[in-house]
């Protein structure tokens, strides 16, 4: 904590300017009025303060705004944003995309994923939903940031906005996020022709249920192995060898390379070895001929 002292008369601050870089920490604390700092935040980023000095300025703002900074201050934080913790950001109410852009630019190149995720979350809450302008801003200034949002926040994305999402924006999305985004994508792209539809839906397929994957296998899409490997394990397991062969088309040979990785490994274990042999890939680990398969999941559901 910064030690409290009285400000020497000759050090009194009437304006936020470059002269402040020569102030010691305790002088900044004693001489800078928090209300003046807040009113002239737009000048702070142009002044080459040390990180220690920025700590003092943050402390003054925290005292002035214990419930969280107003957006007029947040917008002009500049490099002071690097001092913010997710707990600080959680108190904010942000609605302006200009504010979001400014802070995303500042955070670039710094390890601030938790802060950025919290900031985006506050923007979505502030704006009421993840609208097209917000998605466009995220994809332009922070590729991959979409996936930092919780499934609950992503549920506010209108299907009409899904077209603005690019494949690379989904690279870091986990299954729970794709579960939310996939049905929206399916709704958004449902009026497209088969081949165009597959191109659009492919990045979202990690959230697809079994029936959709089965239906895709009837459409000669020739799914690449990378997409297949991102499918939900639960969506892949019920597929027959014939369905996987039709789904992958010429890419079926890639199963051999992925033989030891999920979901391929788990799928192999559920297939009859005789059926696997028809692929001619030398896949091993299937159910030996003559064994009886009991589907206990269905039996449990019926009991």
């Amino acid at each position: 904590d910064v030690e409290r002292t009285t400000c020497p008369p000759e050090k009194e601050v009437h304006e936020i300017d470059e002269s402040l870089i020569f102030y010691k920490k305790r002088e900044l604390e004693a001489c800078v009025d928090a209300a003046l700092l807040a009113a002239q935040m737009d000048r702070v980023d142009a002044i080459p303060f040390t990180y220690e000095q920025l700590d003092v300025l943050k402390h003054k703002l925290d005292e002035l705004y214990p419930q969280g900074y107003p957006e007029s201050v947040i917008r002009h934080l500049g490099h002071l944003f690097l001092k913010m913790s997710p707990e600080d950001i959680r108190k904010w109410n942000v609605t302006s995309l200009e504010t979001l852009k400014a802070l995303l630019k500042v955070s670039k190149g710094h390890e601030m994923s938790a802060q950025v995720a919290t900031l985006i979350d506050r923007v979505v809450v502030g704006r009421g939903q993840l609208d097209k302008d917000t998605v466009d801003t995220l994809t332009a200034f922070c590729p991959g940031c979409l996936c930092s949002l919780s499934p609950e926040r992503l549920s506010s994305v209108p299907p009409s906005v899904i077209g603005a999402v690019r494949p690379q924006d989904l690279d870091t999305c986990g299954p729970r996020q794709l579960d939310v985004l996939y049905p929206k994508a399916r709704l958004a792209f449902q009026n497209m022709s088969g081949s165009e539809y597959f191109v659009k839906i492919r990045p979202f397929l990690g959230g697809a249920p079994t029936e959709d994957v089965k239906a895709l296998s009837q459409q000669n899409v020739s799914m690449d192995l990378a997409t297949f490997m991102k499918l939900r394990r639960e969506a892949v397991l019920p597929l027959t060898v014939a369905e996987v062969q039709k789904l992958l088309g010429p890419h079926v040979e890639g199963l051999k390379v992925e033989e030891q990785h999920s979901p391929v490994r788990d799928w192999i274990l559920k297939q009859r070895q005789d059926d696997l042999d028809t692929l001619g890939l030398g896949l091993q680990g299937g159910i030996p001929n003559g064994y009886l398969i009991l589907d206990l999941s269905v039996r449990e559901a019926l009991s």
Partner: antibody
Framework: QVQLQESGPGLVKPSETLSLTCTVS????????WSWVRQPPGKGLEWIGY???????QSNPSLKSRVIISVDTSKNQFSLKLSSVTAADTAVYYC????????????????WGRGTLVTVSS | EIVMTQSPATLSVSPGERATLSCRAS??????LAWYQQKPGQAPRLLIY???TRATGIPARFSGSGSGTEFTLTISSLQSEDFAVYYC?????????FGQGTRLEIK
């Protein structure tokens, strides 16, 4: 073949929470999206919302603040909770399977439960 | 939300005759429309999806047409079991919405 069966109390008091469960038998809950649809006596159908087995949901904005849809994959069941009910929530509540396969690309219902009448009254 | 309006509210037709039911959307739903049949005390039954594709097991006398905002369900030669309430449903956007229904009764 797959069958759906709704269960829950037929009478709920105003301001309380309506709770219903749909049991999916004859198939896995993991393969599809599952919805709740209701029909007030003598009136039309209203979609309440859907759930995926992972717990991902989408609800009708007109009811969203009062609706919780959840899933229990171990029991092959999904449930509806509707809070702060009034007489206007009196309806036959159906659980239904949303087809929506890519082959036909859509969100409509090819399988329905028989429905259960829930009356809101003190 | 997209409002679906069905007409007429009630349609009286003699067995063996043709019945034509209409459904109008407040904005375009492309061909993302389904039709259901509901008999008293029963759940709805899917008849048509994609505006014109018959669901599995639905007799050929049921046909659907239309695109955009105007849709029609036609039953070419009414059988006694066809007298019921019919609903249209759009799935072009959430929330999914239904028409208020057309009651088809025996004349």
């Amino acid at each position: 073949q797959v069958q759906l069966q709704e269960s829950g109390p037929g009478l709920v008091k105003p301001s309380e929470t309506l709770s219903l469960t749909c049991t999916v038998s004859g198939g896995s809950i993991q393969n599809y999206y599952w919805s709740w649809v209701r029909q007030p006596p003598g009136k039309g159908l209203e979609w309440i919302g859907y759930i995926f087995y992972s717990g991902s949901t989408q609800s009708n904005p007109s009811l969203k603040s009062r609706v919780i849809i959840s899933v229990d994959t171990s029991k092959n069941q999904f449930s509806l909770k509707l809070s702060s009910v009034t007489a206007a929530d009196t309806a036959v509540y159906y659980c239904a399977r949303e087809v929506g396969r890519i082959a036909v690309a859509g969100w409509f219902f090819d399988l329905w439960g028989r429905g259960t009448l829930v009356t809101v009254s003190s | 939300e997209i409002v679906m309006t069905q007409s007429p509210a009630t349609l009286s037709v003699s067995p063996g005759e043709r019945a034509t039911l209409s459904c109008r959307a407040s904005q375009s739903v492309n061909a993302n429309l389904a039709w259901y049949q509901q008999k008293p005390g029963q759940a709805p039954r899917l008849l048509i999806y994609g505006a014109s594709t018959r669901a599995t097991g639905i007799p050929a006398r049921f046909s659907g047409s239309g695109s955009g905002t105007e849709f029609t369900l036609t039953i070419s030669s009414l059988q006694s079991e066809d007298f019921a309430v019919y609903y249209c449903q759009q799935y072009n956007n959430w929330p999914l919405t239904f028409g208020q229904g057309t009651r088809l009764e025996i004349k």
